[in-house]
Every structure is written in structure tokens, then in C-alpha cells.
């Protein structure tokens, strides 16, 4: 057993022309959330049920309102990881689908309060227990940056989380750095060590001493991008010379792009330009259908009558939206201000306010500077309901009560000695240097190398 973890780093317009308009507007603010679906294996014809390895839904991100005239920025993201627990062995190879959904605030009951902004897919090799793998995927004009990893939940260990390790009450007979494993008390498991030099970003191992490459990388240590290793023989006698006499199989040979996608080589691998309605590394993922399980909260999925409406979700009572993801409850009108949490107590609503705010609706920004002095000549600065002190020279800390050590940051260059002084710091420069921070060398003829005015 273990957990697949996905961390979204950014979602925003991709590079190049045709930047998308912000999905939110001043008239219709919105927020994002993400859904990840995992399937085992790398097979194009995977016959598994949708999300056979599991699926997860993120929290809602902060509310975003487009600034008129401004280009769409990276949009504010939900906090935390998406976690997909798996009960059985981690398969090592898996397919993923990551969907970016938009929640339109203030939409109508039963209306399309939810819409799919972007959908990316890919197939990867990944050993459990390995480091975070970083990825960038594009869907239309959008770009999603994320990291992922699989980790075993104790007592499971190993690259597939299939071996059970248990701590022993008796002193271990295993040597340093080794740990006893069940079911054999005498068996000692070494932490998995890949071949020396195996790329931590692009390689992994399932057995000690091996180095297996992630998609798009090759070479004994997985340090060579696929597209640069396609020479069967070098152009000339020197192996340092680049280019190929006989072109080897390129990454686009045989067109890996499905569903009419066109392939183009990239410095690291290849890229498929997909026709409308298809996504994924190889254009293998079509627009959302019932097979993808798009209806949440027990909604019944019915195939749509036309390609633009591939499915319709019939929602159970209490749920709304085109994907039954929105419980339209009495907190939906957002009575709590300044990030307060709305609680429905049954007879009424109550707001739990963030620090620095008060009032029934968290409408009052507490003046934390009132009655709170900053020591040693510091001045109080308000902002966001919190107070902070801007401290006078030589003091620090929340209330300027701590004496700051001006020498802590080692401000004197070129070996100069730093001395704390009541007005700040003084640098005693090493021979050959001068300046308040010993930053300027003194030339032998006596002229200093001061910057030109």
C-alpha cells in the first residue's frame, strides 16, 4: 500500500502566441481545482476501468478576478497535495490524466457552474520511494507544471511497495544502514542503491545497481535525451563532433502521435500537436466521455447526443453543476469576508474568522497596532489584519526587542573583519581592499578600482 502524490506548481498561459484569456472575469470571478486520475500500465489499449489506480480531487483555489486589460497570469492554486492512495502493488508504469476545472462563482443553480479548462495526460515509469519527478504538460494554450512521486505507507517498502518491513523489538543483527524485513526475520534489506551516477531526475531502479530511464531519456545513466542519441555512427573520427552520418531512428519515426496528431522533434524528445478534442503526450486522450468518470458525488453519466456535449451528468439531490461537483449549500453565497470560513449550524450560519479579523461576517480588520508598541524606536506597520514592526537599525524580532547582529550576514567582502557598532557595523578590510564593505581592490599604484561614475 502507498500513496501517489501530485503537487501542482503552476497553471497558466503557455509560451508562444495565442495566450488564452483569463478564465475568470470581473463580472464572473472564479477559482480553480484539479482532478487526477491514475491507471496502471503503459498500454495504448488499456482495458482497465477508469481511474483503476484511483483518483483525487484538490481543494478549491483562492478566488481570482481578472484585472481588465491584464494578460492572463499564472492562476492562484489550491493549497496542498493531491493524494491518491493505492492498496495493492505500485505498478511502476502508469498513465495519468490531470484535469484543471474552473468553478464559476455566482452561477445559476443547475447551470454550468463547473467547466473543464484543460486536460493533460501522459504515461510514465515511476518507482515508489524515489524522488519527486517534475513535468510540464500543455493543453491548448495552457501550461501545467507539476511534480509527482509514489511513496509506500509503512510497513510496506520497495519500489512496488510489496515487501513488508517491521521494526524488531530485539536488537537488530543487521549492519549499519540495513533494516530487518518481514516475513524473514534474518533477511536484512539495504536501502535501494541505483547504479553510481544514475540520473536522479531521469533514472530510477527497481533492483540495486541498475539504472532504468524515464520516458524521453536514454544512456547507461539516463543522462542523454532521446533525440540527441539517435546517431548510429558519428559523422567523423572525433566522437565529440555532433551530427549523424546515418540518421538513426528519430523520436518521430513511425509517428507516435495518435488520432491524427502531428509529431515534431524537441531538444529533449518529441511533441505531438493534437487535433481538436484530443490531449495527452501522444494525443491518446479524447475529450471527456463517460468512460473518464466525469460525474462526481454519485452523478449518473449519460453520453451526449453530439460531439460538443460528450456527456451529461444527472445529479443526485443536493448537488448541482455540469459535473455534480458543487453542493449548493447555504454557504455558497459567501457571507464571510476576508477569507473567513462559513459554518452552517443548521439554524443559521456563522463565520470563523482568520487571524486579524473579527465581526459576525469577519468584516472588521483588527487594528493590531493599537495598544501594541514596537520597542527600541521601531514603527508599527499594518497589513492584512496582522501587525509587524519596522525596526530601527540594530534591532530585530517581532517587536524589535531583539538586538540584531549586523555581522551575521557576513557583509564584509574579501576577508574583511566585521565589528558591531551602536550605529550599525564597521568593516576592517584585509590588506589590498577598501570601501565600506571592503568591496574595492586597491591597485599597487595606490588607485582604487572604484566603479566609473
Amino acid at each position: 500500500a502507498g500513496v501517489f502524490e501530485l503537487q501542482i506548481h503552476s497553471f497558466g498561459p503557455g509560451p508562444g502566441p495565442g495566450a488564452p484569456r483569463s478564465p475568470c472575469s470581473a463580472r464572473l470571478p472564479c477559482r480553480l481545482f484539479f482532478r487526477v486520475c491514475l491507471k496502471p500500465g503503459l498500454s495504448e489499449e488499456a482495458a482497465e476501468s477508469p481511474c483503476a489506480l484511483g483518483a483525487a480531487l484538490s481543494a478549491r483555489g483562492p478566488v481570482y478576478t481578472e484585472q481588465p486589460g491584464a494578460p492572463a497570469p499564472d492562476l492562484p492554486l489550491p493549497d496542498g497535495l493531491l493524494q491518491v492512495p493505492f492498496r495493492d502493488a505500485w505498478p511502476g508504469t502508469f498513465s495519468f490524466i490531470i484535469e484543471t476545472w474552473r468553478e464559476e462563482l455566482g452561477d445559476q443553480i443547475g447551470g454550468p457552474a463547473w467547466s473543464l479548462l484543460a486536460r493533460v495526460a501522459g504515461r510514465r515509469r515511476l518507482a515508489a520511494g524515489g524522488p519527486w519527478a517534475r513535468d510540464i504538460q500543455r493543453a491548448g494554450a495552457w501550461e501545467l507544471r507539476f511534480s509527482y512521486r509514489a511513496r509506500c505507507e509503512p510497513p510496506a517498502v520497495g519500489t512496488a511497495c510489496t515487501r513488508l518491513c517491521r521494526p524488531r523489538s530485539a536488537p537488530s543483527r543487521c549492519g549499519p544502514g540495513l533494516r530487518p524485513c518481514a516475513p524473514l526475520e534474518d533477511e536484512c534489506e539495504a536501502p535501494l542503491v541505483c547504479r553510481a551516477g544514475c540520473s536522479p531526475e531521469h533514472g530510477f531502479c527497481e533492483q540495486p545497481g541498475e539504472c532504468r530511464c524515464l520516458e524521453g531519456w536514454t544512456g547507461p545513466l539516463c543522462t542523454v535525451p532521446v533525440s540527441t542519441s539517435s546517431c548510429l555512427s558519428p559523422r567523423g573520427p572525433s566522437s565529440a563532433t555532433t551530427g549523424c552520418l546515418v540518421p538513426g531512428p528519430g523520436p518521430c519515426d513511425g509517428n507516435p502521435c495518435a488520432n491524427g496528431g502531428s509529431c515534431s522533434e524537441t531538444p529533449r524528445s518529441f511533441e505531438c500537436t493534437c487535433p481538436r478534442g484530443f490531449y495527452g503526450l501522444r494525443c491518446e486522450v479524447s475529450g471527456v466521455t463517460c468512460a473518464d468518470g466525469p460525474c462526481f458525488n454519485g452523478g449518473l453519466c449519460v453520453g451526449g447526443a453530439d460531439p460538443d456535449s460528450a456527456y451529461i451528468c444527472h445529479c443526485p439531490p443536493g448537488f448541482q453543476g455540469s459535473n455534480c461537483e458543487k453542493r449548493v449549500d447555504r454557504c455558497s453565497l459567501q457571507p464571510c469576508r476576508n477569507g473567513g470560513l462559513c459554518l452552517d449550524l443548521g439554524h443559521a450560519l456563522r463565520c470563523r474568522c482568520r487571524a486579524g479579523f473579527a465581526g459576525p461576517r469577519c468584516e472588521h480588520d483588527l487594528d493590531d497596532c493599537a495598544g501594541r508598541a514596537c520597542a527600541n524606536g521601531g514603527t508599527c506597520v499594518e497589513g492584512g489584519g496582522a501587525h509587524r514592526c519596522s525596526c530601527a537599525l540594530g534591532f530585530g524580532g517581532r517587536d524589535c526587542r531583539e538586538r540584531a547582529d549586523p555581522c551575521a550576514a557576513r557583509p564584509c567582502a574579501h576577508g574583511g573583519r566585521c565589528y558591531a557598532h551602536f550605529s550599525g557595523l564597521v568593516c576592517a578590510c584585509a590588506p589590498g581592499y577598501m570601501g565600506a564593505r571592503c568591496e574595492f581592490p586597491v591597485h599597487p599604484d595606490g588607485a582604487s578600482a572604484l566603479p566609473a561614475a
Partner: antibody, heavy 120, light 107 residues
Framework: EVQLVQSGSELKKPGASVKVSCKAS????????MNWVRQAPGQGLEWMGI????????IYNHKFKGRFVLSVDKSSNTAYLQISSLKAEDTAVYYC?????????????WGQGTTVTVSS | DIQMTQSPSSLSASVGDRVTITCHAS??????MGWLQQKPGKAPKGLIY???NLEDGVPSRFSGSGSGADYTLTISSLQPEDFADYYC?????????FGGGTKVEIK
């Protein structure tokens, strides 16, 4: 004194649009939601939707989807109901009614109503 | 949507009579309901909120009771100005819904 004063009666042709206003006074406008309720001639009351004047967030009854838009102008403490593509069956009295945003109270104060007549 | 079934749809009574109107919700609404009075040609007026609390300025002869899905409005001693239409409304869940109304007429 709490008051909700609505705009006057409207006579419109089918296909036209109308914007009914509800001006609030005597309380903090942004602390109360504004409900809109319709009453067709000789019929009961129908809830159309609700708006939070502070944020502009709205929720609509699915029956009043598409042609009906709720909005507010905080600077003038006024809530609006706009109906487009008017039909004969939109002939009714339209009421605004405030409701405490923490739902401690029901719809305690109502506007006097605006009669909208749709006829060719 | 929550259905609010109000009964009776009309009743005739005399001044001084005790009048009871009931409202049944299609599911429990935890007291999140109110009673409204509407006179001909006028806007509705709030009488009761949270099932049992009197709005400001409402005479004490009006009272509300009930819990779960069943609620009652009682006028202990009917006065001439009480002849009107009465509606229940639930605000437990969106969309809010009204009962069909009860017309209280002079016998």
C-alpha cells in the same frame, strides 16, 4: 427605518427587456442578501433568486435561468432585476425582500412590488 | 427541491376564533422556515422566522411552532385586520420554496 423602494410599473412588448430596481435604506446594505420573488396574477409566491450585495455572488432558481439577471450597485444601495426577451407569462408583480446574510432572520422587509405587464 | 404543502388552502372564520394553518415540508428543514401575511394589492409581510420567532411589531396573538418537517401558524384570537393570505416559506436549502397559500376569509 428600514425601507425597500421599488421602481414603478412597466408595460412592455414581448421580446423587450426590463430592469426593475429596489433601493434600500435604513440599514447596512451589504449585510443583508436581497431575494427576488415573483407573483403572477391570482397566483402564489415564487422565489427567483438571491444576491449577496457585498460580493455580487448570486444563486438562481433553476426555473429562472438565463433571461433573469440579478445585480447590485453598492454605491447607491440598489439591487436590480433585469429580464430580457420578455414573454407574456412574465406578466407579474416582482418583489425584492431582504434577508440577514447569516440567515438569523427570514425575509423580514419587502419592497412594495413592481408590476410588469408584457403585452403586444 | 423541497416542496412545501400548506393546508387548508382556504378557511372561513369569525373574529375572535382560533385559527391554525399547517405546512409540511417534503424533508426536514430544522426550523428554517417563516410565515408571511399578504393583504390584497400589498406586498407580503414577515410574521414568523425560524418557525417560532415573531418579527418586530407583530402582535402576540400570532405564534408559530413545529420542528422537522411539520410547522403550524396559530392566530389565537382572529382580528378584523387578520383577514388575508398566509404563506409559509422554507430557507433551509436553495432554491427557497413557498407553500401554496391559505386564504383566511370572514365567515
Amino acid at each position: 427605518e428600514v425601507q425597500l423602494v421599488q421602481s414603478g410599473s412597466e408595460l412592455k412588448k414581448p421580446g423587450a427587456s426590463v430592469k426593475v430596481s429596489c433601493k434600500a435604506s435604513g440599514y447596512t446594505f451589504t449585510d443583508y442578501y436581497m431575494n427576488w420573488v415573483r407573483q403572477a396574477p391570482g397566483q402564489g409566491l415564487e422565489w427567483m433568486g438571491i444576491i449577496n450585495p457585498y460580493s455580487g455572488v448570486t444563486i438562481y432558481n433553476h426555473k429562472f435561468k438565463g433571461r433573469f439577471v440579478l445585480s447590485v450597485d453598492k454605491s447607491s444601495n440598489t439591487a436590480y432585476l433585469q429580464i430580457s426577451s420578455l414573454k407574456a407569462e412574465d406578466t407579474a408583480v416582482y418583489y425584492c425582500a431582504r434577508q440577514d446574510s447569516l440567515l438569523d432572520y427570514a425575509m423580514d422587509y419587502w419592497g412594495q412590488g413592481t408590476t410588469v405587464t408584457v403585452s403586444s | 427541491d423541497i416542496q412545501m404543502t400548506q393546508s387548508p388552502s382556504s378557511l372561513s372564520a369569525s373574529v375572535g376564533d382560533r385559527v391554525t394553518i399547517t405546512c409540511h415540508a417534503s424533508q426536514g428543514i430544522s426550523g428554517n422556515m417563516g410565515w408571511l401575511q399578504q393583504k390584497p394589492g400589498k406586498a407580503p409581510k414577515g410574521l414568523i422566522y425560524h418557525g417560532a420567532n415573531l418579527e418586530d411589531g407583530v402582535p402576540s396573538r400570532f405564534s408559530g411552532s413545529g420542528s422537522g418537517a411539520d410547522y403550524t401558524l396559530t392566530i389565537s384570537s382572529l382580528q378584523p385586520e387578520d383577514f388575508a393570505d398566509y404563506y409559509c416559506v422554507q430557507y433551509a436549502q436553495f432554491p427557497y420554496t413557498f407553500g401554496g397559500g391559505t386564504k383566511v376569509e370572514i365567515k
